[in-house]
Interface confidence: medium
């Protein structure tokens, strides 16, 4: 009876809920209900009733496997779906599926706390900005990874004379996406600029504005 | 070219704790993420703790988390290994050293000894 | 974790010859991101290639790097007398930074 599946998606997309074993043969009776008591479908007697809810015009079953469509999910759409089976025993079976339902995160922003030049080095205080989210960092120098256990919203660094790593990137993920912002330096410190805005790697995130401080301080968390 | 020197190393009893010192001099120290790197006598080389110029992210190597607490002093330009719960496998020479933007070691301290007996 | 084996354990050979040491890793380091370093007995390591094949600040040239994915080598062109110690690589392409277990590089 305890059969829950753990599925995360992405919101806006098509959602299939299914079981990963055959269905009863011959059963009376399939119900996919959101939540224990909310119906969503049942199918009987070689029919399918949907039923007023808010999936009404997004959701298609599949008799023969049991499958939910769902299209365009939401957050809101984030819960326990159970599919109950009643076999020609008169037995029922049920099966569970959470399905958590996350936004694409946004692009970061990279705020530049702090840019000096100090015994002949270039230390950079550097954070990653995105609103309210929960997710995970990953910064890279030149494309080479930090070290994982300093993969939180802020990188500080000190750049030596052989320690040539120009461009900046924070990478924020969950586990449906990853978007990247990236800043590069001029050496041997000082900000790359073109029109008020920090030119980055291509291939590492798109183009990342300059902005101050009091833009950013209601977004910023550590 | 910035400067190390550790100090606070000696003998220990098992389950009995130190606390080792790095002072830097000639660099400004808190703009460095450091490290702790240990040398078993006769053996090779292995890292054991990391922290970051501000003292805002630290990391321990999994044979002494919950054990040992690296910390800094920024204003004493002075680094910090609180080593508690010692037991013999950490006898060796422990060497302070700046992680070069948290990849290779450049320079090092020129280590102290900690000997964990009975 | 990523571990680095270096060969041979010891090397024997006479100041003027030429020392070549091998570093295998268990699995490819990324972008090459390799360091060697040379310990002399009472002193602290020193760092002489960095990304596999770049000299560090004040290294002769004597001393170079190559190598790349899982096969890395530092050769000593012409070895000084004070070119005889042990020497280390050590991998950060990843998390935890870890060392090899050294080869000694000894008089013959």
């Known amino acids: 009876q305890g059969h829950l599946v753990h599925m995360t998606v992405v919101s806006g997309s098509n959602v299939t809920l299914n079981i990963s074993e055959s269905l009863p043969e011959n059963y009376k009776q399939l119900t996919w209900f959101y939540t224990f008591d909310q119906k969503i479908v049942e199918w009987d007697s070689r029919k399918s009733k949907y039923f007023e809810s808010k999936f009404k015009g997004r959701v298609r079953l599949d008799p023969q496997s049991g499958a939910l469509y769902i299209s365009k999910v939401q957050k809101e759409d984030n819960s326990t779906y159970i599919m109950r089976v009643l076999k020609k025993t008169g037995n029922e079976q049920e099966w569970k599926i959470k399905l958590q339902v996350l936004d694409p995160v946004p692009k970061p922003v990279i705020k530049i706390e702090k840019i000096e030049d100090m015994d002949d080095n270039c230390y950079l205080k550097l954070s990653c900005v995105i609103p309210g989210e929960s997710v995970n960092y990953t910064w890279y120098g030149d494309k080479r990874p930090f070290p994982k256990e300093l993969q939180n919203s802020v990188l500080e660094t000190t750049l030596m004379p052989h320690n040539y790593s120009r461009c900046y990137t924070c990478q924020v993920s969950n586990s449906v996406s990853s978007k990247n912002g990236t800043v590069c330096l001029s050496p041997p410190c000082t900000l790359a600029r073109s029109e008020q805005k920090l030119i980055s790697e291509e291939d590492l995130g798109g183009e990342q504005k300059l902005i101050s401080e009091e833009d950013l301080h209601h977004h910023h968390h550590h | 070219e910035g400067q190390l020197l550790e100090s606070g190393g000696g003998l220990a009893q098992p389950g009995g704790s130190l606390r080792l010192s790095c002072a830097a001099s000639g660099i400004t120290f808190g703009r460095y993420a450091m490290s702790w790197v240990r040398q078993a006598p006769g053996k090779g080389l292995e890292w054991v703790s990391l922290i970051s110029g501000s003292g805002g992210s630290t990391y321990h190597a999994d044979s002494v988390k919950g054990r040992f607490t690296i910390s800094r002093d920024n204003s004493k330009n002075t680094l910090y290994l609180q080593m508690n719960s010692l037991r013999a496998e950490d006898t060796a020479v422990y060497y302070c050293?700046?992680?070069?933007?948290?990849?290779?070691?450049?320079?090092w301290g020129q280590g102290t000894l900690v000997t964990v007996s009975s | 974790e990523i571990v680095l084996t270096q060969s041979p354990g010891t090397l024997s050979l006479s100041p003027g010859e030429r020392a070549t040491l091998s570093c295998r890793a268990s699995q490819s380091v990324s972008s090459n991101y390799l360091a060697w370093y040379q310990q002399k007995p009472g002193q602290a390591p020193r760092l002489l290639i960095y990304?596999?094949?770049s000299r560090a600040t004040d290294i002769p040239d004597r001393f170079s790097g190559s190598g790349s994915g899982t096969d890395f080598t530092l050769t000593i062109s012409r070895l000084e007398p004070e070119d005889f110690a042990v020497y280390y690589c050590?991998?950060?392409?990843?998390?935890?930074?870890?060392f090899g277990q050294g080869t000694k590089v000894e008089i013959k």
């Open positions: 050590q991998q950060y392409g990843s998390s935890p930074r870890t």
């Open positions: 990304d596999a094949s």
């Open positions: 050293a700046i992680y070069n933007n948290y990849n290779w070691f450049d320079p």
